[in-house]
Interface confidence: low
């Protein structure tokens, strides 16, 4: 039977009358357009929502915007247009909400033509209230807040200037002209490229990086031939054209530009890219694109300094076309990561790696399910996810993936159970273990979201129809309750609940449609009354995470170490409540093999631990150029997993020598560069 | 009006430890790189340490790695140098200076550190 | 490391004379290169910074050219207040950010 269906799933008690009693409707005076939708801080309540709505006329095109705000999570809305002057914002520029709980707001105004620069409405109160400024230029992109200091902002303009606000955009002063990006790095530094010679498009693979720390006061080059860059964790990454062809390499720093070294990666031609998947302050995951429009390339994962890479997952689909990618962080799970393969036969499968990319495998086929018509093997084969490149191919696939840092072990994900994945319609899936266990959760696609650190979950059926029904769930998926939110069913447009998955509260968002008019309709539907108390300890299970043979005694090693969880039970019907802390016990795990990647010239064989010396660099020398120096590695093949805890047990030799001989990349010797200052 | 004022010099025995302190005003500290230079007597201009705006990054000449500790307080709008294991070749008067990027803009006006039995 | 050789290491020179400093670098740094003042028993003052820009507050008579390798500060008009001694530093790539060893412009 479908889950949810059997004997054994516990009602939740007269919920009905409770989500009725919690329901809240709010039409919007307003003629259907486009919605969108930003929680201001965290816990604060406060929803902003921007209605547009664009009237064709014959010769232009007349906007119209509306601003609403709620402060009860969405209960209620307020229309506040007026503290903006009724003035038309541009919905491209979204609104632009500060870091952390800072409670400023930019939007951004439509400008008429011959205006000598663009208008700004600024709020450093949560949205209360609103001051009207006007540029000095025609922003380009979204204001960009500094990540330490929420006053600091920065902005391109139609003229690719780069400017900057000291004062939460009171004034602004432009620090530089002929930019193609800027980045605010750590310490309220700002990395950008600049053009000599006539545009970004046109000196692409001869830019400029420059840096800045201290506002635009003075400048330092810090490469040039550039011709992207990227911030990652720790490091930033120029990718830097090659001296005698046309082929690009990535360089890397963890000082912020001052000192570089070149990346032990492939270089990548015209066609090519370079995509930094993932990367966090002990690691890189990187993407090169394989040569020709194959769709697919290969991932390296780094060393602790971005400089050394191991081959991680051979035809990794990345399309460049579209730039999709399926390539998922599970954040409900230390070292989880869930991506798409292209296989020799051009179908695609899902592959996930429980160790931070050292070794990767399929899905396990859910119990619950069959083996679909893609499976050769009708008893052998595995779950497939639909992300991005599904999404992006029109599948029928409303949402991709997700996971919450604070709903320990949840993954929710559209999938298909074959050998690969499946143009059919799909099932939704959960995982409540990281991903190693599979277990068909709802019928058909649909949108879902986690509610009250995994406490709730709640989904909405993906249809072309009118729904007025809300499906929940209090354990983790097993057994599901649907709840008649309005007589009247609504075009649904999407679920909003506040970021970070501590809120007990869903919005639904769709519109009504007449005879006459269509507007937008919000219901929120607080579950606080579904969760009557609060959890306490008996309703809380220890659980050892990645556990696959409770028998080791390395068990849950992952990473060199492993970590028990404090978890809900799922037959428990309780509150986790805001201020929910995960609660975690981390214990260190004697060294094996898999606390080791394989190191600059070796390789790990499939099904194997061991590594090997790649083929074609057998008896050569290791050598590497490490900050414009040769070094030299002497390795037995092994290397540190980056945040690998482990201690005792396998201690495989490395040693890197200096060679004291000069090695340059052509970053470190360009033909000309310029430098200045303000 | 930027100003700079080391403090901490002195008369030190080899083997001992001294910790320069620099007291920055007049400027907002928390946005400057900053730097140690020192000079010995009758001799040139020698790059000591540099530390980035928020204390993240910090940077030595190969001879010093390991004696040599910058660090900066920018609550308090302090830079400091922690000076271990000293010898009679680090006698030199210290300067701290604002380091924005590509240059040292303002300097200290110094302070004499001189290392002897 | 980038060495830095800075010539002459000494110059005798008359008020309203015409004066040249040069800086060679080991390799090139981009114009990251700043000159500084040092008169005796006083803390250096800034004068050029990335190669060609005068500090605030530097007389006009200073100033600083050059690229790739070879930097020079040239002091249009000598007055009396300039004898002093005169440090290039470079500010490229891998520290250590290494200061050269100074000229000595003394009166004629």
């Known amino acids: 039977s479908a889950p949810g269906e059997d004997e054994e799933c516990g009602r939740v008690r007269d919920f009905v009358a409770k989500l009725a009693n919690n329901t809240h409707q709010h039409v919007f005076d307003d003629l259907r357009g486009s919605v969108s939708l930003s929680w201001v801080g965290d816990s604060t309540g406060v929803i902003l929502v921007l209605t547009t709505f664009h009237v064709p006329l014959v010769i232009m095109t007349f906007g119209q915007s509306k601003l609403y705000r709620s402060e009860d999570y969405g209960k209620n809305f307020k229309d506040i247009t007026d503290l903006i002057n009724n003035t038309f914002i541009r919905t491209e520029f979204g609104m632009a909400i500060g870091p952390e709980n800072s409670g400023k707001v930019v939007l951004t105004a439509e400008v008429s033509g011959g205006s000598r620069g663009g208008r700004i409405f600024r709020s450093s109160d949560f949205a209360k209230n609103f001051v009207q400024t006007d540029l000095p230029f025609h922003p380009l992109t979204q204001m960009m807040y500094s990540p330490q200091n929420s006053d600091y902002l920065l902005a391109l303009s139609t003229e690719n200037g780069l400017w900057v606000s000291k004062n939460f955009g009171g004034k602004w002063e432009e620090i530089h002209k002929a930019v193609c990006l800027a980045k605010w790095g750590s310490d309220n530094t700002i990395f950008f490229t600049t053009y000599a010679n006539g545009s970004c498009k046109a000196d692409l693979g001869a830019l400029e990086l420059w840096r800045t720390s201290d506002l635009g006061k003075s400048f330092k080059t810090i490469g040039v031939k550039i011709y992207s860059f990227g911030l990652g964790g720790r490091f930033l990454f120029a990718s830097v054209m090659a001296d005698k062809d046309t082929t690009r390499r990535i360089h890397v720093s963890t000082d912020q530009g001052d000192t570089w070294s070149m990346a032990q990666l492939p270089s990548v031609g015209q066609e090519q890219f370079y995509s930094i998947l993932a990367a966090n302050d002990d690691m890189v995951f990187m993407h090169v694109d394989e040569p020709g429009d194959t769709g697919f390339g290969t991932i390296f994962t780094s060393d602790d300094r971005g400089i050394v890479y191991s081959k991680s997952l051979d035809r990794h689909l990345y399309t460049t076309t579209g730039g999709e990618t399926d390539f998922t962080n599970v954040t409900s799970l230390r070292g989880v990561y869930i991506t798409s393969v292209l296989s020799e036969d051009n179908s695609i499968q899902t592959m996930i790696t429980f160790d931070q990319g050292g070794r990767w495998t399929h899905l396990r086929k859910p119990e619950n399910s069959e083996c679909d018509a893609t499976a050769k093997n009708k008893n052998e084969c595995s779950l497939h996810i639909h992300a991005s490149y599904s999404i992006s191919q029109k599948l029928n696939v409303p949402m991709a993936p997700l996971s919450e840092p604070n709903a320990v072990g949840i993954v929710i994900a559209h999938g298909s159970v074959g050998d690969a994945i499946s143009v059919m319609v799909p099932d939704v899936y959960i995982s409540d273990d990281g991903g190693y266990s599979w277990t068909k959760m709802l019928e058909g696609p649909h949108y879902y979201t986690i509610l009250d650190s995994g406490g709730i979950i709640v989904a909405i059926e993906h249809s072309s129809r009118p729904i007025n029904v809300i499906k929940f769930s209090t354990d983790e998926g097993q057994c599901w309750q649907t709840y008649t939110f309005t007589r009247d069913p609504i075009y649904f447009t999407g679920l909003a609940s506040e970021p970070g998955a501590r809120s007990m509260n869903i919005s639904i968002w769709g519109f009504t449609e007449s005879f006459l008019t269509s507007q937008w309709v919000s219901y929120t539907i607080d579950f606080k009354d579904i969760l009557e108390r609060n959890c306490e300890e008996k309703d809380y299970t220890i659980w050892l995470a990645h556990s696959t043979d409770p028998e080791d005694y390395e068990d849950g090693c992952i990473l060199g170490y492993k970590e028990q969880f404090l978890r809900l039970r799922k037959s428990s019907v309780c509150q986790n409540g805001r201020d929910y802390v995960v609660t975690k016990q981390p214990s260190i795990c004697l060294c094996s093999l898999e606390d080791f990647l394989c190191d600059f010239g070796y390789y790990r064989p499939e099904n194997d631990s061991k590594c090997v010396e790649q083929p074609e660099l057998k008896g050569h020398d290791l050598e590497f150029c490490l900050y414009g120096r040769e070094e030299h590695l002497t390795t037995n093949g092994y290397r540190k997993i980056p945040g690998d805890k482990c201690q005792g047990g396998v201690n495989p030799v490395r040693e890197v020598k200096d060679l004291k001989k000069k090695c340059t990349s052509n970053f470190l010797s360009p033909e000309k560069q310029n430098s200045k200052s303000n | 009006e930027v100003q700079l004022v080391e403090s901490g010099g002195g008369l030190v025995q080899p083997g001992g430890s001294l910790r320069l302190s620099c007291a920055a005003s007049?400027?907002?500290?928390?946005?400057?790189?900053m730097s140690w230079v020192r000079q010995a007597p009758g001799k040139g201009l020698e790059w000591v340490a540099t530390?980035?705006?928020?204390?993240?990054?910090?940077y030595y000449p190969d001879i010093l790695k390991g004696r040599f500790t910058i660090s900066r307080d920018n609550a308090k709008n302090s830079l400091y140098l922690q000076m271990n294991s000293l010898r009679a070749e680090d006698t030199a008067v210290y300067y701290c200076a604002r380091h924005p990027g590509g240059a040292m803009d303002y300097w200290g006006q110094g302070t004499l550190v001189t290392v002897s039995s | 490391d980038i060495q830095m050789t800075q010539s002459p290491s000494s110059l005798s020179a008359s008020v309203g004379d015409r004066v040249t400093i040069t800086c060679r670098v080991s390799e090139n740094i981009y114009s990251n290169l700043a000159w500084y003042q040092q008169k005796p028993g006083k803390s250096p003052k800034l004068l050029v910074y990335?190669?060609?820009n005068i500090a605030d507050g530097v007389p006009s008579r200073f100033s600083g050219s050059g690229s790739g390798t070879d930097y020079t500060l040239t002091i249009s008009s000598l007055q009396p207040e300039d004898f002093a001694t005169y440090y290039c530093q470079h500010f490229w790539g891998t520290p250590p950010w290494t200061f050269g060893q100074g000229t000595k412009l003394e009166i004629k």
């Open positions: 530390i980035s705006s928020g204390g993240i990054y910090t």
């Open positions: 990335a190669a060609t």
């Open positions: 007049g400027f907002t500290f928390n946005i400057y790189g």
